[in-house]
Interface confidence: low
């Protein structure tokens, strides 16, 4: 039975040209995390594998940095980066847990750095 829950940074906004940290945290389970996938819509951004370490997809290697922890740092943000991001935790023996983050990249300097809404 899957008892865990994913906590995320929720809905966040950032300025064009800036950076943002996407973070998820898996709690309430003793399952072993074997891998975390970071995806944007249907595109794979990065993977952190417990045994093999980090891999950044080639098309994102100039703008994506691993960490902190199992999180992901997006750099040189553009308006096109606006959208849904998913952290997919592969665990044993529970299976797969998925968290969702919505990022809005704003043109102006009114963007808040950090969570604007919190997803429970």
């Amino acid at each position: 039975m899957m008892t865990g829950t994913i906590e995320t940074t929720g809905n966040i906004s950032a300025e064009k040209g800036g950076s943002i940290i996407l973070q998820c945290h898996l709690s309430s389970t003793t399952a072993q995390v074997t891998q975390v996938n970071w995806e944007q819509q249907d595109q794979l951004l990065a993977i952190c594998n417990a045994d093999l370490g980090w891999h950044i997809s080639p098309s994102f290697k100039d703008r994506v940095a691993p960490g902190p922890g199992l999180g992901l740092t997006l750099q040189s943000l553009t308006v096109n980066d606006t959208g849904e991001y998913f952290c997919i935790y592969h665990t044993y023996p529970d299976g797969t847990y998925t968290g969702r983050i919505f990022l809005e990249v704003l043109e102006s300097s009114v963007a808040e750095h950090g969570a604007r809404f919190q997803i429970p």
Epitope: N37, L52, H55, P58
Partner: nanobody, 122 residues
Framework: EVQLVESGGGLVQPGGSLRLSCAAS????????MGWFRQAPGKEREFVAA????????YYADSVKGRFTISADNSKNTAYLQMNSLKPEDTAVYYC???????????????WGQGTLVTVSS
């Protein structure tokens, strides 16, 4: 849905050999990397070995280098782990796994086998 079925485990004396097999029920080899992990009692699951879909690249944990050999037969959709000079510390449940293949790196484990027990004891 692809399933992985391991076989070949059992009881063997220290210094002995075993050959594990991992049969895939659907097309796996060629576009995927196949690998082996193991989990000893009371310990975390650890990487053992992997082989690229082409068979050109193999990877081994330091603890098994020179003793274990991974291979694959694309025509049979089967991966193998030849284990020689077995030690008591090799005792574990051995799991077969499948990766999606990325250029230069191997990730995204999406299918696990159920495991086969290897016991090394005199």
């Amino acid at each position: 849905e692809v399933q992985l079925v391991e076989s070949g485990g059992g009881l063997v004396q220290p210094g002995g050999s075993l050959r594990l097999s991992c049969a895939a029920s659907g097309p796996t080899l060629g576009s995927y990397v196949m690998g082996w992990f193991r989990q000893a009692p009371g310990k975390e699951r650890e990487f053992v070995a992997a082989i690229s879909g082409s068979g050109d690249d193999t990877y081994y944990a330091d603890s098994v280098k020179g003793r274990f050999t991974i291979s694959a037969d694309n025509s049979k959709n089967t991966a193998y782990l030849q284990m020689n000079s077995l030690k008591p510390e090799d005792t574990a449940v051995y799991y077969c796994a499948r990766w999606r293949e990325f250029p230069g790196y191997y990730f995204a484990i999406d299918v696990w086998g159920q495991g086969t027990l290897v016991t090394v004891s005199s």
